[in-house]
């Protein structure tokens, strides 16, 4: 991908809710020169990607659970 493509936010919008069972992994991108806000990008079990609302309590729980399962593996 070109540098121009990468230096921008990757989330067009955010899903307000998603069932954790559909999520394979979660990538939390901190704010930086490419994007002013935190982005939570979930890889779904069907191979698609989805952006989640980092302020959502459900999403916070999902991130916490994923990070904990990563630590235990």
């Amino acid at each position: 991908a070109s540098v121009a493509t990468e230096l921008r936010c990757q989330c067009l919008q955010t899903l307000q809710g998603i069932h954790p069972k559909n999520i394979q992994s979660v990538n939390v991108k901190s704010p930086g020169p490419h994007c002013a806000q935190t982005e939570v990008i979930a890889t779904l079990k069907n191979g698609r990607k989805a952006c989640l609302n980092p302020a959502s309590p459900i999403v916070k729980k999902i991130i916490e659970k994923m990070l904990n399962s990563d630590k235990s593996n």
Epitope: L12, Q13, R48
Partner: antibody, heavy 121, light 111 residues
Framework: QIQLVQSGPELKKPGETVKISCKGS????????MHWVKQAPGKGLKWMGW????????TYADDFKGRFAFSLETSASTAYLQINNLKNEDTATYFC??????????????WGQGTLVSVSA | DIVLTQSPASLAVSLGQRATISCKAS??????????MNWYQQKPGQPPKLLIY???NLESGIPATFSGSGSGTDFTLNIHPVEEEDAATYYC?????????FGAGTKLELK
């Protein structure tokens, strides 16, 4: 089930304005971006741009800046495409398509049935 | 803009045979390990139907007679075996960057 239903065909004269609608159902309308695609008779597909259904912010492809406007009525789960000062070359079928939330989206799985706009004096 | 060049513009294939359609992008559509190339089928009077997303993933409800492959700039849609209802126009589309672009289309006819 997820559906996008568009308004019916329109016959207009050059210089007039047309506004076509696309109503989403079966999903949370404000979760997903909405895109518009033009197909002139017997031709291929051309992406016109998209509207953020959370914020209402539109993004237009270069060829569709100026006379074209995307808008929303979120309470009715409906997106609109308005074309001002119609020209003969605007004669086409216009499709709405539900996009994703990730910039590198994986294609449009849901489309409206299309709205034919015919422009003729 | 990323230009997508489809070939051939049209092809005629016998029932049960293989149809192969190529799509070449003017620059890479890869990002973060994925290739953002999608394939659609369109029949007259109907909207396009998504067949393949992210180069090789079969959309839900699409028969396994359709498959996609490729990365970077070179992509292929295969249909095997070709069935009667596959007569249509096929488009590739990149979703790597704005403006999103489509190939000019390949018309598949049955011999």
């Amino acid at each position: 089930q997820i559906q996008l239903v568009q308004s019916g065909p329109e016959l207009k004269k050059p210089g007039e304005t047309v506004k076509i609608s696309c109503k989403g159902s079966g999903y949370t309308f404000t979760d997903y971006s909405m895109h518009w695609v033009k197909q002139a008779p017997g031709k291929g597909l051309k992406w016109m741009g998209w509207i953020n259904t959370e914020t209402g912010e539109p993004t237009y492809a270069d060829d569709f800046k100026g006379r074209f406007a995307f808008s929303l009525e979120t309470s009715a789960s409906t997106a609109y495409l308005q074309i001002n000062n119609l020209k003969n070359e605007d004669t086409a079928t216009y499709f709405c398509a539900r996009g994703g939330v990730y910039r590198y989206d994986e294609g449009f799985a849901y489309w409206g049935q299309g709205t034919l706009v015919s422009v003729s004096a | 803009d990323i230009v997508l060049t489809q070939s051939p513009a049209s092809l005629a294939v016998s029932l049960g045979q293989r149809a192969t359609i190529s799509c070449k992008a003017s620059q890479s559509v890869d990002y973060d390990g994925d290739s953002y190339m999608n394939w659609y089928q369109q029949k007259p009077g109907q909207p396009p139907k998504l067949l393949i997303y992210a180069a090789s993933n079969l959309e839900s409800g699409i028969p396994a007679t359709f498959s996609g492959s490729g990365s970077g700039t070179d992509f292929t849609l295969n249909i095997h075996p070709v069935e009667e209802e596959d007569a249509a126009t096929y488009y590739c589309q990149q979703s790597h960057e704005d403006p999103l672009t489509f190939g000019a289309g390949t018309k598949l006819e049955l011999k």
